[in-house]
Amino acid sequence: APRGTQAEESPFVGNPGNITGARGLTGTLRCQLQVQGEPPEVHWLRDGQILELADSTQTQVPLGEDEQDDWIVVSQLRITSLQLSDTGQYQCLVFLGHQTFVSQPGYVGLEGLPYFLEEPEDRTVAANTPFNLSCQAQGPPEPVDLLWLQDAVPLATAPGHGPQRSLHVPGLNKTSSFSCEAHNAKGVTTSRTATITVLPQQPRNLHLVSRQPTELEVAWTPGLSGIYPLTHCTLQAVLSDDGMGIQAGEPDPPEEPLTSQASVPPHQLRLGSLHPHTPYHIRVACTSSQGPSSWTHWLPVETPEGVPLGPPENISATRNGSQAFVHWQEPRAPLQGTLLGYRLAYQGQDTPEVLMDIGLRQEVTLELQGDGSVSNLTVCVAAYTAAGDGPWSLPVPLEAWRPG
């Protein structure tokens, strides 16, 4: 035969009742026992587990004068703001002498209007771009059927007939509101209303139209913007920094960008005041009354080289017999590119001009024809880059060399 001590009679004279209500309800479970001698501590169980943090109070009333007489012990468990996690079977547990006693169970149930676990959130979407919205609700009682509404218009004939937890929207051309209704046997709860703001699509095909040393002309194709016309587009240019290395789609430039606004149409803009022969990254976003599109990826571009903007400086030319010594300094004005060298021209009063490419040197000794009797000799110097020659210096007369 199965082993086990015959249990003594249960000390419980009152067992927990049942509570069923909506979320947020406050209720009390109560159990009562009659014991002889010192009253035990009453513990509460939910689904067979001791409640470590129970909001319980215990009252003990002696039924006689002597400590060994009977006591009535009442334990009350307070449930504040009923939640799903509070539901289950409740019992009182006492340890009396050598034995463990458990009361008959009471039940706590939840029953009310549906409760939202997830509601649609405000968001921005690009025009005509698919997206999903989420809504989730629970009872009890179950089942809970959902009905989605767009701009207060139901998207299905009845709750539970259309999309449930996830609503797929193939695209919008105007800012719209979405909400969901949760229906169960107790009634209807309506979620918050989410505003879905329709922004312009990201512009496409950002490209260079023309290049000048200090300006770039760029163009792009605008994306769809729904029923909202584009008001302007914003172009940003930033100096490329090899150290930072802007990657395609990197969210922020490494420094404060140069920002220009373009009226649209046309979807084209001339960016000026740039550095010649300099790499830049550019991007564009377009704005409607609803807000800006996302930026395009950064596009690497480069301004071309220009010619030096000024002549070489401090030119001096001295003559000693049939030789002339000429030297100069780099132009102070911007070179607009990589200096490739200098050109020198000299000419007498009645003689043809002689042109020379000096390279990157900043001095030259000229061998003059004849005995050097050519009069009124003058020298001009110009710097050049791959883009061409810069301006020539003013003619500098060759002075006779005076020793010491």
Partner: antibody
């Protein structure tokens, strides 16, 4: 009087499944956890898992998670343990016991001897 | 998981001798809410199901002879048989029920 009644023996073939029963009486079945314990011949006691009849909430020893499934039938106050893909390693005595929240009294079934043999 | 370790795994004594066996848990078995230590000792005689001797580490189950005593706190527990009788031939298991159940490996008591 509290009783946990188990059949004395079961013989099954390797690879088969079996469902052992434990019929409870003499107390409120839904209010106490039922534990299952395994004992192979000449070996010690191993806790398999437990089930709370009211909610069918279960806990398992990791070692038995893929081997054993605990269920209850409240209407007949019976607890069950089902084994799948049986091998000779599953040959053992299986006890059901009523948990008393760490205290006393303590009730055990007499155990079912499961033999897996072809 | 709580691990229970018993020692020795077996011992042989003569009738009338005192016996102690040890059980160690990998963590404390004291429940702060109920202020109980969830450790039990079982006796299993050959061919029988286990029988509860001690619960709450030191409380003797009714009907168990007073030669059986449980002691210990925290993680170290001892079962003492003050004067072994021939009928005490059995395997003794400790069990924690602080968090689910775990049994120790058992101590086999033989009578010389």
């Amino acid at each position: 009087q509290v009783q946990l009644q188990q059949p004395g023996a079961e013989l099954v073939k390797p690879g088969a499944s079996v469902k052992l029963s434990c019929k409870a009486s003499g107390y409120t079945f839904t209010s106490y956890w039922i534990n299952w314990v395994k004992q192979r011949p000449g070996q010690g006691l191993e806790w398999i898992g437990n089930i709370y009849p009211d909610s069918s909430s279960t806990n398992y020893n990791e070692k038995f998670k893929s081997k054993a499934t605990l269920t209850v039938d409240k209407s007949s106050t019976t607890a069950y343990i089902q084994f799948s893909s049986l091998t000779s390693e599953d040959s053992a005595v299986y006890y059901c016991t009523r948990d008393t929240y760490g205290g006393s009294p303590d009730y055990w079934g007499q155990g079912t001897t499961l033999t897996v043999s072809s | 998981d709580i691990v229970m370790s018993q020692s020795p795994s077996s011992l042989a004594v003569s009738a009338g001798e005192k016996v102690t066996m040890s059980c160690k848990s990998s963590q404390s078995l004291l429940n702060s809410r109920t202020r109980k230590i969830y450790l039990a000792w079982y006796q299993q005689k050959p061919g029988q199901s286990p029988k509860l001797l001690i619960y709450w580490a030191s409380t003797r189950q009714s009907g168990v002879p007073d030669r059986f005593t449980g002691s210990g706190s925290g993680t170290d527990f001892t079962l003492t048989i003050s004067s072994v009788q021939a009928e005490d031939l059995a395997v003794y298991y400790c069990k924690q029920s602080y968090n689910l159940w775990t049994f120790g490996g058992g101590t086999k008591l033989e009578i010389k």
